[in-house]
Interface confidence: low
């Protein structure tokens, strides 16, 4: 024997109430499936969070962040407060990359600067709180008296900021 | 690497006492430091820590006045007042798993053996 | 304050089962939730952090998963050295959130 709630399409749900006929979701409620006894409830985007996508009688809301946080989590579950570049998110607020390390963008940790000279490279451009350095030729590429120099990059977990 | 509390005794209610925890192999201008106790027989709680880098505390509200936490370049210190005999308890400190203000890096992987406080008259 | 808070406080298997430990955290925390094992007379030990990330080390019988505010911690092929409490830890601390204790109460484990 069938199922006779398998014949309810998504955005229905097989009403037990009503000899197990298919009847629309109330409203704020949705079933992506067939077959469903109950409607899930909407999500509701409140506070930080703002709607990307309206709830549907087929699909739930689906939330973003407000200006100045970014999501966090499955689905977007968390709002967390950016930063600038060249910044790194501490219990204390946002705070400015140590010396000798960056973040380039307005989320995440800041992470050491790359070692040139781990690469037998030597350091073309500086590093800044924003920017990780450029590495170029190595030394002995350069002609003799071209002065090369490498950053020192601070110790710690790589992709950690260290002080 | 490795850290070690020191200065624990049996102290009478209401006198003060300062706690230390010495690093080796690291320095703590790179780490979160925390304190932490544990009374006998019951679970972890946490006093507060402080950031190496910037010298930022923060505290378990109910430790706020009370507890002060300071650093040197090689120890951080865990000051108490007004001790009662429900500070009795296991003082354990430890440091962060990674370098870094983040609060993504405030997991702890480098812990003390403890030192023990006993507050009685 | 963000409270935390563990299920069961004590909890009994044999030796080649599974037990699972459960973490709720009184408000999201996203993903930043760790695990610690303690044996007597012995200092805390990180086990997992970021929910699910094994400390070096770590067998891969330890498993974390969750996120939010639901959190889980499973322990397979339980071993006899398993035996210990086991405490969460969030450590969510963006949109000046606080918390009283960062621990949750702890789970004894028990192997038969």
């Known amino acids: 024997l069938q199922d006779p709630c398998s014949n309810c399409p998504a955005g229905t749900f097989c009403d037990n109430n009503r000899n197990q006929i298919c009847s629309p979701c109330p409203p704020n409620s949705f079933s992506s499936a067939g077959g469903q006894r109950t409607c899930d409830i909407c999500r509701q985007c409140k506070g930080v969070f703002r709607t990307r996508k309206e709830c549907s009688s087929t699909s739930n809301a689906e939330c973003d962040c407000t200006p100045g946080f970014h999501c966090l989590g499955a689905g977007c579950s968390m709002c967390e407060q950016d930063c600038k570049q060249g910044q790194e998110l501490t219990k204390k607020g946002c705070k400015d990359c140590c010396f000798g390390t960056f973040n380039d963008q307005k989320r995440g940790i800041c992470r050491p600067w790359t070692n040139c000279s781990l690469d037998g490279k030597s350091v073309l451009v500086n590093g800044t709180k924003e920017r990780d350095v450029v590495c170029g030729p190595s030394p002995t590429d350069f002609s003799p008296g071209t002065p090369s120099t490498t950053m020192p990059v601070p110790g710690g977990e790589p992709g950690h900021t260290s002080h | 690497q490795s850290v070690e509390e020191s200065g624990g005794r049996l102290v009478t209610p209401g006198t003060p006492l300062t706690l230390t925890c010495t690093a080796s192999?690291?320095?703590?201008?790179?780490?979160?430091m925390i304190w932490v106790r544990q009374a006998p027989g019951e679970g972890l709680e946490w006093i507060g820590d402080?950031?190496?880098?910037?010298?930022t505390t923060d505290y378990a509200s109910w430790a706020k006045g009370r507890f002060t936490i300071s650093k040197t370049s090689t120890t951080v210190d865990l000051k108490m007042t007004s001790l009662t005999t429900e500070d009795t308890a296991t003082y354990f400190c430890?440091?962060?798993?990674?370098?870094?203000?983040?609060?993504?890096?405030?997991?702890?992987?480098?812990w003390g053996q403890g030192t023990l406080v006993t507050v009685s008259s | 304050d963000i409270v935390m808070t563990q299920t069961p406080a004590s909890v009994e298997a044999a030796v080649g089962g599974t037990v699972t430990i459960k973490c709720q955290a009184s408000?999201?925390?996203?993903?930043?939730l760790a695990w610690y094992q303690q044996k007597p007379g012995q200092p805390p030990k990180l086990l997992i952090y970021?929910?699910?990330t094994l400390e070096s080390g770590v067998p891969s019988r330890f498993k974390g998963s969750g996120s939010g505010t639901e959190f889980t911690l499973t322990i397979s092929d339980l071993e006899s050295a398993d035996a210990a409490t086991y405490y969460c830890?969030?450590?969510?601390?963006?949109?000046?959130?606080?918390?009283?204790?960062?621990f949750g109460g702890g789970t004894e484990v028990v192997v038969k």
């Open positions: 408000q999201s925390i996203s993903s930043y």
């Open positions: 970021r929910t699910s």
């Open positions: 830890q969030g450590y969510d601390w963006s949109s000046s959130n606080r918390y009283d204790n960062t």
């Open positions: 430890a440091r962060a798993r990674y370098s870094g203000g983040s609060y993504a890096n405030y997991v702890f992987n480098l």
């Open positions: 192999g690291f320095t703590i201008s790179s780490y979160h």
């Open positions: 402080i950031y190496g880098g910037t010298a």
